[in-house]
Interface confidence: low
């Protein structure tokens, strides 16, 4: 079965820059990635970034910079409005399209005792199941 | 032509409950995040409902949570709204909207169906 | 909940002025936020997202503008058909509207 992982980074040197990874794990190929913030995407959630494999990729801010890593796997930073730090204790989703398998989603957030820099990935959490 | 039509409405007495209808054309509704957006008498909008695509999230205020159930048709191109326990504040024009995942807002709007509560 | 206020909650303008609608979040929303017009006795419908894109047919003489906390409409040389109620809302996680202008006819 597809899953897909989040991991939520607080960076070491800049303390109001975060960093979300997802990945995607099963066979296909990703058609569309969607990140968004404060709960799944289309369902309470704010989109953040779209990454298309061939059409590039489109962000709305606080995202700074959406990337791929991976065939399989993005990063996107993000840029803290400042002191009352929103992003410390806030829920990040990822939805992967895949053909044939269909949309996967999970969400993750900072772990609440990390320190800046360091976050273990979490087990992935399967929101939603397959569109 | 993207067009959204509403049905359902009507009086009904507190405590009672009434079911809203969407149909859909004009677009690949199985695609689109649906919402419920109501306005009071007053003039107030307020989002009451709103569901994913393919209807497995939904999402609701607390001021409706536990009390109306979202769900969708992607066969029928229909969207529901199950309302129950209504209130007096519950009175409202509801409309069916489209919510856009591109520009994160209502795109489109039917014309909306008007509820009472009222004894 | 992110409150929205807008003001003022009416005004009355003349055919050909300019008008500027301003619309304010209890916190920062960035530049999630869209207008509606409306219509008496019509729906809502959109004319302004991500704070200063226009709808694809609205006229040019809409504008939107403004960041963070403080959010404005502007619209240029009224028309006839421009006289009616203007919303904001926040789309930054669960939207909410503002209260509403009302533009009249002076």
């Known amino acids: 079965t597809p899953e897909v992982w989040v991991q939520v980074q607080m960076e070491a040197t800049e303390l109001s820059s975060f960093t979300v990874h997802c990945g995607f794990l099963g066979p296909g190929s990703i058609s569309l990635v969607t990140v968004s913030w404060g709960g799944p995407d289309g369902a309470g959630g704010t989109k953040l970034a779209v990454l298309h494999p061939e059409l590039g990729t489109r962000q709305w801010a606080p995202a700074r910079q959406a990337r791929w890593e991976t065939q399989s796997s993005i990063s996107l930073a993000l840029e803290d409005s400042g002191a009352s730090s929103p992003f410390a204790n806030t829920t990040f989703c990822c939805k992967f399209a895949s053909f044939p398998e269909g949309s996967w989603e999970s969400c993750g957030s900072l772990p609440p005792s990390s320190d800046p820099g360091l976050s273990a990935p979490p087990t992935p959490v399967p929101i939603l199941r397959a569109d | 032509e993207v067009k959204l039509v509403e049905s359902g409405g009507g009086l009904v007495q507190p405590g009672g409950s009434l079911k809203l209808s969407c149909a859909v054309s004009?677009?690949?509704?199985?695609?689109?995040?649906m919402s419920w957006v109501r306005q009071t008498p007053e003039k107030r909008l307020e989002l009451v409902a709103k569901?994913?695509?393919?209807?497995?999230?939904?999402n609701y205020p607390d001021t409706v949570k536990g009390r109306f159930t979202l769900s969708r048709d992607n066969v029928k191109n229909t969207l529901y709204l199950q309302m129950s326990s209504l209130k007096s504040e519950d009175t409202a024009i509801y409309y069916c909207?489209?919510?856009?995942?591109?520009?994160?807002?209502?795109?489109?709007w039917g014309q909306g169906t008007s509820v009472t509560v009222s004894s | 909940d992110i409150q929205m206020t807008q003001s003022p909650a009416s005004l009355s303008a003349s055919v050909g002025e300019t008008v500027i609608i301003t619309c304010r979040a209890s916190?920062?929303?960035?530049?999630?936020l869209a207008w509606y017009q409306q219509k008496q006795g019509k729906s809502p419908h959109l004319l302004v997202y991500?704070?200063?894109t226009l709808v694809e047919g609205v006229p040019s003489r809409f504008s939107g503008s403004g960041s963070a906390t403080q959010f404005s409409l502007k619209i240029n040389s009224l028309q006839p058909e421009d006289f009616g109620t203007y919303y904001c809302?926040?789309?930054?996680?669960?939207?909410?509207f503002g209260g509403g202008t009302k533009l009249e006819i002076k």
């Open positions: 909207t489209r919510y856009s995942w591109d520009v994160y807002a209502m795109d489109y």
């Open positions: 004009g677009f690949t509704f199985s695609s689109y995040t």
């Open positions: 569901i994913s695509n393919s209807g497995g999230s939904t």
């Open positions: 916190e920062n929303i960035y530049s999630y």
């Open positions: 991500n704070a200063e």
């Open positions: 809302q926040h789309h930054y996680g669960d939207p909410t």
